[in-house]
Structures are given as structure tokens and as C-alpha cells.
Interface confidence: low
């Protein structure tokens, strides 16, 4: 006859281990007793336990409550065993010996692979600005038994560059992204993906990137300088902008305070009535936590009693 | 790559107070134990705490117990050591030291600390 | 607080030569204990961490071994510039102690 077992047993930290050893022998053998013992290179065999075919199982003090018969019915020729709840310090080699009559003892060895799955945790890199270099958006860090992959799923172009850390029983994998920053990656997300032979499907923790930028500023409202007249109605002065953080808005008149009656409303400059007092030039200051922005327009309201050749220009234009 | 840089060589009196600053580059600051070691001169090494800047939970050998504060600046990515009530057997070079978690892999050029009346 | 007891505490040897520096914990610290090269001046440097894992770039004429009390580092074949201080660290329970050191002189 002979024993049939497994090379190796792998389980998830926590599930039950099967442990096989099934003696296929001829018509007429009989199974006496399986001893099952850890022997690990280097030290001695300690014995988990021992099935004897009119006895039971006697399961060694080391291993009390942790190791059982597989359920019924049982094969009398089946020397397995179940090492329940299986934690790191149980991967090993492990030896089955089985006594038979007539013909006689017979030893297989096989290891238990017990896997620890990670729990991946992602940090994000310091806070991202337009006009940085090369930079570290996040890292992504697991731990487990055997060492874990880690590997990035974006649209963001970036590089990255990992590192293994070995522990006694487990290795941690960190993994980095770093990329040159720029607004359109805003709102985009950076997912870290961890494989692993324990895990049923890969882990992911996405990250949205934030980059902080603050584009030029422009005003808008004096594209037709001959419509601010003395006396015209809601005349006003619009800042464009845009970043992130979104910005505020202020503005001033670099040549004096604001004319009374000019109304600000964030990013609007509003004014009553034209009158020549509100000639001037007027800054739109444009600030947010990265950056700071200036532009400035000249406004200048015409009296049509001071200039009527031009206006008269302008009627002929029309 | 990673550095750490630490702060001038300080000469104290004693009952004084020193602060040394350790600035990390080239890695995620969050994410690694920064721990703090002396050395006496022509002794051997002496561990005096630890810092994990990720939630600032510290760690103090109880023999710097209640005269050592350990800090981290995330902002600036820089851990700092304090140590109060100096004496003059605290003259020594003070390293700081990454760690993950409790093997230190990158260290600091050190900070010789002298305490002297 | 467990002891870290390293020996000799001065060792001369040759180039070429093979060198062995033990340190003895005073109760088991599994396989949590690190050895570091210090060169005068200058801040020490990882070697070996988890007893037996050569650190990146630490050439590989040095080896660690050992498990529980008794720990061994080992250069296979000396050169010059391994003229340094070597200290244990036991990193298995605070507060982390090191070795006294072994100073190690080239003949």
C-alpha cells in the first residue's frame, strides 16, 4: 500500500487546516494507529495528535480543543486531521505515520501555508501644488504572509517606485505614486490595488487627487470702452478666475477708495449711475491658500458734451 | 532618497532645556516611527523614545520619563526632542532615527549636545 | 529591561580574515534584534534587522543568524573599511536596548 497526502496545505489565517493522510492499501490491511507530529528543521517533533482505531483520538496537550477527526462517516483506512483555526505560528511541516497490519509503518511529510491577508492602508503625500516637480501624491502600504502585490490603477500619468520590508513571519510591501501635478488631475482618483493569494478579490482604496492652482485673472465688462458713458445704467466689471481651492475676490481702486455707490459682489464690481468721478483704475485681487492674483483695467467714463465729434463718429458708425 | 537633517551642536547650562529638530525627506513622514537615541561620549547607545507622526502617539524609555516631549510637525514634516532639567551627564550626540516600526533603518547626522557651567 | 550582552568587546583581525561578534539577550527576544556599523564621526548604519535580513546595499559577506537569547554577526572576509564600532539592538520590547559595542581594529 501506500500514503496519500498533499505537498502542501494552504489555508487562510483563521480557517480550519485539513490535514490529509489516507492510506490506500490492499484488500484485507488494516489501519492500527496515525500519529501526526509538527517537525520543523531544526527542532525536535512535537506531537499533535494520535487516532488509534479502538482507542480514538488523543490529541496532545499542546494542540487540547485545536485538533479533530474530520466529520462523519470516516473511512477507517483516513488518517486526517482538522487543525482548527489556523494561526501563523502553525505554518510548518507536518508528518503523518501510519501503522498498518500486516504491512507494516509507513511516513509522509507535507507543509502548512497559512496566509495572512493584508489590510492595506493608502496615505496621501503632502498637498499638491501646480508647479511642483516630480511629487508624492500617496503611499500604499500592506502586510502579509507571503508578501502581497501592490500596484496603482489611474488614468494619472505618474511613476512608482515599491519597497519590501520582511518581518519574522510576514513582509510589508509600500508602494508610492509620485506625479508632476497639474489642475487636470483634480478630482481624479488614484487607486491603490493589493493582491494576495488569501484575499477572494483584489482590495482597492481610491484616493481623489487635489491639486492646488490659481489661473490668471482677467476682467470682463469694458470690451466696448464707448458704452461707459456719463449717465449709463448698470455698467459692471466681472473678474474671471478659477482655481482650488475656489478663490475670493476683492477689489480696489488703485487710485483713490472705491467711488460711493460701486457695489461689490464677490467676483462683480457693480456701479450706480456713471458720473466722470468713477474714472479710475480698478484692481481685481484674486486669492486663495496656494496663490494670489492682480489684474487691473482703466476705466474711463466719456461726456459726450466734452467729446460730441466722437460721438457723432460712433452714430455715423452705427 | 530619505534624509534626515538635524538641527546644530547646542552648548547648555545646567537646569537648562534643549530642543532638537530632526527634518525628514524622501519618504511618506506620516507613515514611519521617528525615534530618538544618545550617545555618550566614547559609550555605547542609549534609546530615549519614540514618535509615530501619523496620529502622534509617543513612547518614552521611563529613565526620560516627565524630563523628555517628543513632537512631530507635519506641516514641515520635522519631529523634535526636548529635554528639560539637563545635567552634565546628558552632554552627548543626539541622532534621530526612522524606523518601521521598530528597526531604525535611516538615521540623522546627529546633534552634539553639550551641558557645561 | 533586557540586557544585550555583546562580545568581545575589541577584536583585531586581518584582511581576509573571517569574523564572528555574539551577543547574549538576557531573555528571549525571538528573532527582533538588529546590528548596526558605526564608523567613527559619524551616525550609525543599518546592517542586519530580524536577526538574518541583510539590509539594502550591505554587501553580502555579512550574515546574521540566531534565535531567542543567542544572536551571531558574521563578515565572511574582512576588508578595511569594515573598521567600525557594531552594536545588537533588541527591538522585541521596550525600552529597545543596545549591545555595548565591539570595536573592531584591523591588524
Known amino acids: 500500500g501506500e500514503l496519500e497526502t498533499s505537498d502542501v496545505v494552504t489555508v487562510v489565517l483563521g480557517q480550519d487546516a485539513k490535514l490529509p493522510c489516507f492510506y490506500r492499501g490492499d484488500s484485507g490491511e488494516q489501519v492500527g494507529q496515525v500519529a501526526w507530529a509538527r517537525v520543523d528543521a531544526g527542532e525536535g517533533a512535537q506531537e499533535l495528535a494520535l487516532l488509534h482505531s479502538k482507542y480514538g483520538l488523543h490529541v496532545s496537550p499542546a494542540y487540547e480543543g485545536r485538533v479533530e477527526q474530520p466529520p462523519p462517516p470516516r473511512n477507517p483506512l483516513d488518517g486526517s486531521v482538522l487543525l482548527r483555526n489556523a494561526v501563523q505560528a502553525d505554518e510548518g511541516e507536518y508528518e503523518c505515520r501510519v501503522s498498518t497490519f500486516p504491512a507494516g509503518s509507513f511516513q509522509a511529510r507535507l507543509r502548512l501555508r497559512v496566509l495572512v491577508p493584508p489590510l492595506p492602508s493608502l496615505n496621501p503625500g503632502p498637498a499638491l501644488e501646480e508647479g511642483q516637480g516630480l511629487t508624492l501624491a500617496a503611499s500604499c502600504t500592506a502586510e502579509g504572509s507571503p508578501a502581497p502585490s501592490v500596484t496603482w490603477d489611474t488614468e494619472v500619468k505618474g511613476t512608482t517606485s515599491s519597497r519590501s520590508f520582511k518581518h519574522s513571519r510576514s513582509a510589508a510591501v509600500t508602494s508610492e505614486f509620485h506625479l508632476v501635478p497639474s489642475r487636470s488631475m483634480n478630482g481624479q482618483p488614484l487607486t491603490c490595488v493589493v493582491s494576495h493569494p488569501g484575499l477572494l478579490q483584489d482590495q482597492r482604496i481610491t484616493h481623489i487627487l487635489h491639486v492646488s492652482f490659481l489661473a490668471e485673472a482677467s476682467v470682463r465688462g469694458l470690451e466696448d470702452q464707448n458704452l461707459w458713458h456719463i449717465g449709463r445704467e448698470g455698467a459692471m466689471l466681472k473678474c474671471l478666475s478659477e482655481g482650488q481651492p475656489p478663490p475670493s475676490y476683492n477689489w480696489t481702486r488703485l487710485d483713490g477708495p472705491l467711488p460711493s455707490g460701486v457695489r461689490v459682489d464677490g467676483d462683480t464690481l457693480g456701479f450706480p449711475p456713471l458720473t466722470t468721478e468713477h474714472s479710475g483704475i480698478y484692481v481685481c485681487h484674486v486669492s486663495n491658500e496656494f496663490s494670489s492674483r492682480d489684474s487691473q483695467v482703466t476705466v474711463d467714463v466719456l461726456d459726450p458734451q466734452e467729446d460730441s465729434g466722437k460721438q457723432v463718429d460712433l452714430v455715423s458708425a452705427s | 532618497q530619505v534624509q534626515l537633517v538635524q538641527s546644530g551642536s547646542e552648548l547648555k547650562k545646567p537646569g537648562a532645556s534643549v530642543k532638537v529638530s530632526c527634518k525628514a525627506s524622501g519618504y511618506t513622514f506620516t507613515s514611519y516611527y521617528i525615534h530618538w537615541v544618545r550617545q555618550a561620549p566614547g559609550q555605547g547607545l542609549e534609546w530615549i523614545g519614540w514618535?509615530?507622526?501619523?496620529?502622534?502617539?509617543?513612547k518614552y524609555n521611563e529613565r526620560f520619563k516627565g524630563r523628555v516631549t517628543i513632537t512631530a510637525d507635519k506641516s514641515t514634516n520635522t519631529a523634535y526632542m526636548e529635554l528639560s532639567s539637563l545635567r552634565s551627564e546628558d552632554t552627548a550626540v543626539y541622532y534621530c532615527?526612522?524606523?518601521?516600526?521598530?528597526?531604525?533603518?535611516?538615521w540623522g547626522q546627529g546633534t552634539s549636545v553639550t551641558v557645561s557651567s | 529591561d533586557i540586557q544585550m550582552t555583546q562580545s568581545p568587546s575589541t577584536l583585531s583581525a586581518s584582511v581576509g580574515d573571517r569574523v564572528t561578534i555574539t551577543c547574549r539577550a538576557s531573555q528571549s527576544v525571538n528573532n527582533d534584534v538588529a546590528w548596526y556599523q558605526q564608523k567613527p564621526g559619524k551616525a550609525p548604519k543599518l546592517l542586519m534587522y530580524y536577526a538574518s535580513n541583510r539590509f539594502t546595499g550591505v554587501p553580502d559577506r555579512f550574515s546574521g543568524s540566531g534565535y531567542g537569547t543567542d544572536f551571531t554577526l558574521t563578515i565572511s572576509s574582512l576588508q578595511a573599511e569594515d573598521l567600525a564600532i557594531y552594536f545588537c539592538?533588541?527591538?522585541?520590547?521596550?525600552?529597545?536596548?543596545f549591545g555595548q559595542g565591539t570595536k573592531l581594529e584591523i591588524k
Open positions: 539592538q533588541q527591538a522585541y520590547r521596550s525600552p529597545y536596548t
Open positions: 514618535i509615530y507622526p501619523g496620529n502622534v502617539n509617543t
Open positions: 532615527a526612522r524606523s518601521n516600526p521598530y528597526v531604525m533603518d535611516y
